[in-house]
Interface confidence: medium
């Protein structure tokens, strides 16, 4: 299990910027316009545009309220007029440089509209949002805009019992088959498009990936066994001519594995997914947050998957088929029979075109019937190194974003920012042999779940934005200036931070104007380069005989041990003479002449089998 975060920052301790509008709740849709330096925020009955550099500066706002009549009709159907029968913004996607595509639950009558970014007004199109946006604000949803067409995963009816993955397109709308083998009570988490590789074969197609958790179709237990999935469809899919008419011909899904090797610890509830794309990466990497199905202990894990592994399962894996096996928990088994050509579920690529299959509309019925009956792959998608990147106890992770950053020595590190259901943000760096949890920041004053996380990693301007029920918070990727000494700065093992001996401060890397000459950073936590010992200061105290002295010591690191020394001997709390307050401050009881002298508070921190010792405070005590 991962260690506790080395540092804990309380809400008021660090520089966080907040945005919220009184009376507005559920800030759950965030969209960044990097070129405009604007963050768009979708909340309940409102959309805002705020300055991405300082989100407390609101630029525009527009309200989209539900009429009293609609509210009443919704309430008649047994829904809450005060909460459920409102308009929760669920889709906030870019349509063009001057407009956004916005959908809301609209009192259980999902509706979509175009938001003009110049006037910041809705165009009043009121398109039916069925299949694009959930009816119920409590139901899961995901969407991505690809080439002006909305790809969504949500529920298609009032009850939320008909799941759908669809493409809203004027010329070629497509959807999933309403059948349990395709989607079985899914909880949608994430969707994104992966563009064809520029080095890949000619005629490849872009693919849209959907991530969700669903009830297992392949196993049957006493309880509903949940299984995390990745599904994919091809952008060029146009449906079938007869079989699978107006349905996906390229819909395939596979199980995601995230488990601790050689233990029974299986993480099968998917919470969030982030696609890491970076110049140094050969291919995108999917980072995913999971919790176990029976999570009475508060466990969370992060697993990472390469695009190649996901693609391999869909392009070369075996299929599953429905089986009727008596006295067996297995309902689906591996299909070993002949597979039609072209391969079922494959995108129309140059190979297919060479065989005269120029579109999914002229695929043979055999291929279409096969994919209709076998949407589930037998092979599972396994994580990088066959194990989670991180397993954390006593926490329920909700969202994740990942930044790839270059340390002072030129090494690239993946830094994960993972939010919790109690309003905190954990920051963890993936090192060669371990994951180091750098810090935990309490983003929201109240312990409320983080609903959405967004990373803006524009050069020279990097922030994490978090949305919750009460508002949005903007946090920098590092709080380097909070590390007061060279040792603290290096022990943080934060790739964004380095110590500048010239200005005797911990500074943030990659600030355009700064020269990093002579800066000190060591991702193994080696502080031996920290030579500039700051001038020792001491606190002088005078106490009366028989009294009690309290000597203060402030230690931030949760991984360090505080040691008090008097005349070079370590003081133990076990003796009746001494006590500790909060494992840091020292109490000396029944003072006498022999207690006069120099008391030193040191922190001892184990890093890579070495103990780093730092003097935190020096107290000179005189008993009169």
């Amino acid at each position: 299990f991962a260690p506790v975060p080395r540092l804990t920052w309380e809400h008021g301790e660090v520089g966080l910027v907040q945005f919220h509008k009184p009376g507005i709740f559920n800030y759950s849709a965030l969209l960044m316009s990097e070129d405009k330096d604007t963050l768009y925020v979708g909340a309940r009955e409102a959309v805002f545009a705020v300055n991405a550099l300082n989100i407390s500066e609101k630029q525009h706002e527009v309200y989209w309220k539900v009429s009293e009549d609609k509210k009443s009709k919704c309430a008649e159907k047994g829904k809450s007029k005060q909460t459920e029968c409102l308009n929760y913004i669920r889709v906030l996607q870019p349509l063009s440089s001057t407009s956004l595509y916005v959908c809301g639950t609209n009192a259980f009558q999902p509706t979509c509209d175009h938001l003009n970014l110049t006037s910041f007004k809705f165009l009043g199109k009121s398109e039916d949002g069925k299949g694009r946006c959930p009816f119920d604000p409590a139901h899961s949803y995901t969407s991505v805009m690809v080439g002006g067409e909305l790809y969504s995963g949500t529920s298609y009816n009032f009850l939320g019992s008909e799941p759908i993955i669809s493409r809203n397109s004027s010329h070629s709308p497509l959807r999933t088959e309403y059948a349990i083998p395709w989607l079985n009570e899914p909880s949608f988490v994430f969707a994104d498009v992966i563009q064809k590789s520029p080095d890949g074969p000619e005629g490849e197609d872009d693919k849209v990936y959907f991530f969700f958790t669903e009830v297992s179709v392949e196993y049957e237990f006493v309880f509903k066994l949940m299984i995390p999935r990745v599904a994919r469809v091809c952008k060029g899919d146009q449906g079938g001519l007869r079989t699978l008419q107006k349905k996906w011909t390229s819909f395939l899904k596979a199980r995601l594995i995230c488990s601790k090797p050689d233990s029974g610890l299986v993480f099968n509830i998917l919470q969030d997914v982030f696609v890491l794309r970076a110049p140094g990466l050969k291919e995108p990497v999917f980072y995913a947050v999971f919790t176990p199905q029976l999570n009475n202990v508060g466990l969370s894990a992060v697993c990472a998957y390469t695009l190649a592994t996901v693609e391999a399962v869909f392009s070369r894996g075996k299929y599953m088929q429905s089986a009727t096996v008596e006295q067996s928990h297995t309902k689906w088994v591996r299909y070993n029979g002949p597979v039609p050509t072209p391969r079922p579920g494959a995108c129309i690529d140059s190979e297919a075109r060479a065989a005269n299959y120029t579109s999914s509309l002229n695929l043979p019925d055999k291929t279409l019937q096969f994919v209709k009956d076998h949407p589930l792959m037998d092979d599972s998608v396994t994580p990088i190194d066959n194990r989670p990147k991180l397993i954390k106890k006593d926490v329920n992770y909700t969202q994740i974003v990942v930044d790839r950053t270059q340390a002072l020595d030129g090494t690239f590190y993946d830094v994960m920012f993972i939010s919790t259901d109690r309003g905190a943000l954990h920051k963890a760096v993936i090192l060669t042999k371990e994951v180091h949890v750098i810090e935990e920041t309490q983003l929201f004053r109240d312990s409320e779940p983080v609903l959405t996380l967004l990373l803006s990693s524009k050069k020279g301007r990097k922030f994490v934005y978090a949305g919750s029920n009460s508002g949005v918070v903007q946090a920098p990727l590092a709080f380097c200036e909070k590390h007061g000494s060279c040792e603290d700065c290096v022990l943080a093992r934060d790739p964004y931070c380095a110590w500048s001996p010239a200005i005797k401060a911990c500074v943030t890397l990659h600030q355009e104007e700064a020269s990093s000459r002579g800066w000190i950073q060591d991702m193994s936590g080696d502080t031996s380069s920290c030579l500039d010992k700051s001038k020792e200061s001491f606190n002088q105290h005078f106490f009366k005989h028989g009294g009690t002295a309290e000597l203060k010591c402030f230690q931030k690191s949760n991984l360090a041990r505080v040691v008090w020394k008097f005349q070079n001997g370590e003081l133990k709390a076990a003796s009746p003479k001494y006590g500790f307050v909060g494992r840091k401050h020292l109490l000396i009881f029944n003072l006498s002449d022999g207690d006069s002298g120099v008391y030193q508070c040191l922190s001892e921190e184990r890093v890579r089998n070495k103990t780093v010792s730092q003097l935190l405070a020096k107290h000179v005590l005189e008993v009169k």
Epitope: T309, R316, R334, D378
Partner: antibody, heavy 122, light 110 residues
Framework: QVQLQESGAGLLKPSETLSLTCAVY????????WSWIRQPPGKGLEWIGE???????NYNPSLKSRVTISVDTSKNQFSLKLSSVTAADTAVYYC????????????????WGQGTLVTVSS | QPVLTQPPSASGAPGQTVTISCSGG????????VNWYQQLPGTAPKLLIY???LLASGVSDRFSGSKSGTSASLAISGLQAEEEADYYC???????????FGGGTKLTVL
């Protein structure tokens, strides 16, 4: 870290029964298939058969009539019996874990024992 | 006789690229994925490539795998002396309902 260790008689006479056991340390036993693979001196690898924690087996058709693989989940062990041995059965015998994700095509031998040499000689 | 066919030997000078082929049939390489193993003298085999072309954990990216139809191949670029070993391909065979190996290729670094 998972470790596999083979044990059993190293020298046999023709027509005897070869008997080997593989002990699995440091890992979960269920969820995997466990294989026996052999390698005659100076030759290539030959798969003998596999078993999972519940006793389900698959055998190499060419050896099927002489092979029995069994499992003891309480001890995290699995065993190989090869009857009526001849000099052609002289080989280094390896046990290995077959990792199955899904049911088969996504599979591989990810952990191996160090191997034990079995010699058949009169 | 091994079900999968590999050349018995291959060689290359340090720094060169060497390719080892593995030929099978429809019931094994054609429909199932191929794994490659390296066996250094006197040791047990070690997994190099799985699922046709995915690199096993801790293996140098100078090793790469590929597959087309019923043939697979292993390529080693920037050859190093310590890579002198036997290399085996393996796949599941649907007809035999079992694992099949190639006969192995002895790689010599000149």
């Amino acid at each position: 870290q998972v470790q596999l260790q083979e044990s059993g008689a190293g020298l046999l006479k023709p027509s005897e029964t070869l008997s080997l056991t593989c002990a699995v340390y440091g890992g979960s036993f269920s969820g995997y298939y466990w294989s026996w693979i052999r390698q005659p001196p100076g030759k290539g690898l030959e798969w003998i058969g596999e078993i999972n924690h519940s006793g389900s087996t698959n055998y190499n058709p060419s050896l099927k009539s002489r092979v029995t693989i069994s499992v003891d989940t309480s001890k995290n062990q699995f065993s190989l019996k090869l009857s009526s041995v001849t000099a052609a059965d002289t080989a280094v015998y390896y046990c290995a874990r077959t990792r199955y994700y899904g049911s088969g095509s996504w599979s591989l031998f990810d952990y191996w024992g160090q191997g034990t040499l079995v010699t058949v000689s009169s | 006789q091994p079900v999968l066919t590999q050349p018995p030997s291959a060689s290359g000078a340090p720094g060169q690229t060497v390719t080892i082929s593995c030929s099978g049939g429809n019931s094994n390489v054609g429909t199932n994925t191929v794994n490659w193993y390296q066996q250094l003298p006197g040791t047990a085999p070690k997994l190099l490539i799985y699922y046709d072309d995915l690199l096993a954990s801790g293996v140098s990216d100078r090793f790469s795998g590929s597959k087309s139809g019923t043939s697979a191949s292993l390529a080693i670029s920037g050859l190093q002396a310590e890579e002198e070993a036997d290399y085996y391909c393996a796949a599941w065979d649907d007809t035999l309902n079992g694992w099949v190996f190639g006969g192995g290729t002895k790689l010599t670094v000149l």
